[in-house]
Amino acid sequence: MKVLQEPTCVSDYMSISTCEWKMNGPTNCSTELRLLYQLVFLLSEAHTCIPENNGGAGCVCHLLMDDVVSADNYTLDLWAGQQLLWKGSFKPSEHVKPRAPGNLTVHTNVSDTLLLTWSNPYPPDNYLYNHLTYAVNIWSENDPADFRIYNVTYLEPSLRIAASTLKSGISYRARVRAWAQCYNTTWSEWSPSTKWHNSYREPFEQHHHHHHH
């Protein structure tokens, strides 16, 4: 039994780091392998992660962590029974993948304006709470070419757009993801998408309506 692709890990900078690797053949990850991890810190102890299968030869392990600070460094040991397959280290602050934003809501009751809001995935005491920026993806279910990205570079988890920038009378979906420039993170996964029917009065119709009075 050998490791084909060495473990690579990312941290959510809160409570979980996820490590993935590939073996040289089909493996029952949960029964055959153990990933031991230990914070490099005085009087810390080794903890065991039981991996799950991620494809035939792939394994994934979710390492529980109390919290994360930039100084943290972990040793990682991948064991198959008594055989040490791989030894490495992982510094969570250098491999951050933020949690996905949640609770994406589209408010359509504001006159001719769409207000999209979502929740910051971190509690206020987490360092990333005040350092996330977002990308909002809006697309039409009817027209694959109608696909747009809005970059939200301010901290507030919301986006206002004119309803008229989208086509009227059709359904749209939106999703949002996050990243933090301070740690040069990767993008988070996309949030679950939310759907709404875009309808608004065309400017011409409004003008015509005005002249009838």
Partner: antibody, heavy 125, light 112 residues
Framework: EVQLVESGGGLVQPGGSLRLSCAVS????????MSWVRQAPGKGLEWVSS????????YYADSVKGRFTISRDNSKNTVYLQMNSLRAEDTAVYYC??????????????????WGQGTTVTVSS | DIVMTQSPLSLPVTPGEPASISCRSS???????????LDWYLQKSGQSPQLLIY???NVAAGVPDRFSGSGSGTDFTLKISRVEAEDVGFYYC?????????FGQGTKLEIK
Amino acid sequence: EVQLVESGGGLVQPGGSLRLSCAVSGFTFSSYAMSWVRQAPGKGLEWVSSITGGGGGIYYADSVKGRFTISRDNSKNTVYLQMNSLRAEDTAVYYCAKDRISITIRPRYFGLDFWGQGTTVTVSS
Amino acid sequence: DIVMTQSPLSLPVTPGEPASISCRSSQNVVYGNGYNYLDWYLQKSGQSPQLLIYLGTNVAAGVPDRFSGSGSGTDFTLKISRVEAEDVGFYYCMQSLQAPYTFGQGTKLEIK
């Protein structure tokens, strides 16, 4: 009520051995690291050794490395200090102390918040 | 090893007056989580040491509120707002960020 009670001290000749014990009650022993600290007559405090709650992590002062062995029996709520090749400079009162919670991913530290009454080790010919 | 240096080594104080002991470490004893791994202990005559302050500023359970700790990085201070007769003894600072734990030489507080 937290209690730590050391025993096993005594008079021993240079080169001899002693085994100190520290019996603990009043807290979840296996969750906590334990430490030994000594104090030579008329001198200050000197850290000797520490062990994690599970026993997998062990640390020694350079002055005792290779001669002293720390261990613990979580089923007996006891931590031990096996002292071999004793020297005159090992003469001291030996204290055991409750250290940090070590079973968490990041050890939680609240100081050496409880100490035993100490046991005296005298190394002399 | 981290060297801990205390001053003064002897501190005569009048009851009711404040007292201050300084402790300096040869290396930073703060970890990335912002905690300073610096404690203060009092050893009264014929007794075991007792914890006063942990992680630089936290007052241990049962310790009178006249004791306080301050400082960060390499410079720390133990203050007693109003010294009482029962406060006499040796005061030690100790770093526990890395092994070996190291203590200061001790400060003897005595009543004038």
